[in-house]
């Protein structure tokens, strides 16, 4: 889980070691700043949980880019 | 293809305590979140707990809480699940199940099940 | 947690009919971004671990015959055998995957009449 140290600067210093299916994925934030130890991203899950991940790996890139066709497209 | 082989069938006093192995083959466990079901004679499927990355840790439905132990051995890709203070309504055939190569909360694969016979 | 419930209990059918299973969820299992409602069926026949038939409520999985069909969405959902045949003789069962702990109903057991 992410940890807020000091708000609103929020921080993850472990990754979820499992591949989530994209579709219990609602949304994600990428985590750049100076003050965290690495960079990362926060998936939110579709009953709000958040998972920190690692920006490194495929699945993770996979989900994102997934998430991004997703809001792209408009609902009929 | 996912394969899971489970440890064979337990006659368990009340009391006690019973340890169900389930051996991965085809992925690494790591790739899965392995769960456990267990059925009791003629009665329906009940969801047990398993490994859940929203969480982080494994999580044990609630009336199991404090009971139930489910570990896992990365280096044999095997999973297991001890249950303790066995009562005669633990009598069960016990499966191990996991997701479709990502952690989803439904199951494609199962193992064989073990039969676990709770008896004084 | 999220109770499933399943209707009928029993239910005996003629072969080539068409038996449908209720399930009826406590709270809806659909979300509204993915338009995905979060509900899987499986068939378990005797002394066998059971099967995965649909999940997403209407997704066939892979191999499983095209005469198996489910429909429905948020709270009511239904599987549907378009002609029954001796093979389909097993207990089926829903389970939601929307939020844990997952959940089952209590099955429904189909056999020929």
């Known amino acids: 889980q992410p940890d807020a140290i000091n708000a609103p600067v929020t921080c993850c210093y472990n990754f979820t070691n499992r591949k989530i299916s994209v579709q219990r994925l609602a949304s994600y934030r990428r985590i750049t700043s100076s003050k965290c130890p690495k960079e990362a991203v926060i998936f939110k899950t579709i009953v709000a949980k958040e998972i920190c991940a690692d920006p490194k790996q495929k699945w993770v890139q996979d989900s994102m880019d997934h998430l991004d066709k997703q809001t792209q497209t408009p609902k009929t | 293809q996912v394969q899971l082989v489970q440890s064979g069938a337990e006659v368990k006093k009340p009391g006690a305590s019973v340890k169900v192995s389930c051996k991965v083959s085809?992925?690494?466990?790591?790739?899965?979140?392995m769960h456990w079901v267990r059925q009791a004679p003629g009665k329906g499927l009940e969801w047990m707990g398993g490994f859940d990355p929203e969480d982080g840790e494994t999580i044990n439905a609630q009336k199991f809480q404090g009971r139930v132990t489910m570990t896992e051995d990365t280096s044999t890709d095997t999973g297991y699940m001890e249950l303790s203070s066995l009562r005669s309504e633990d009598t069960a055939v016990y499966y191990c199940?996991?997701?479709?190569?990502?952690?989803?909360?439904?199951?494609?694969?199962w193992g064989q099940g073990t039969l676990v016979t709770v008896s004084s | 947690d999220i109770v499933m419930t399943q209707s009928p209990d029993f239910l005996a059918v003629s072969l080539g009919e068409r038996p449908t299973i209720n399930c009826k969820s406590s709270?809806?299992?659909?979300?509204?971004?993915?338009?995905?409602?979060?509900l899987v069926w499986y068939q378990q026949k005797p002394g066998q671990p059971p099967k995965l038939l649909l999940y997403?409520?209407?997704t066939r999985e892979s191999g499983v015959p095209d005469r198996f069909s489910g429909s429905g969405s948020g709270t009511d959902f239904t599987l549907t055998i378009s002609s029954l045949q001796a093979e389909d003789v097993a207990v089926y069962y829903c389970q939601q995957y929307y939020s844990s702990p997952w959940t089952f109903g209590q099955g429904t057991k189909v056999e020929i009449k």
């Open positions: 085809g992925y690494t466990l790591t790739e899965l979140s």
């Open positions: 199940a996991t997701d479709p190569g990502g952690y989803s909360g439904y199951f494609d694969h």
């Open positions: 997403w409520a209407s």
């Open positions: 709270q809806s299992v659909f979300y509204s971004s993915n338009n995905k409602n979060y």
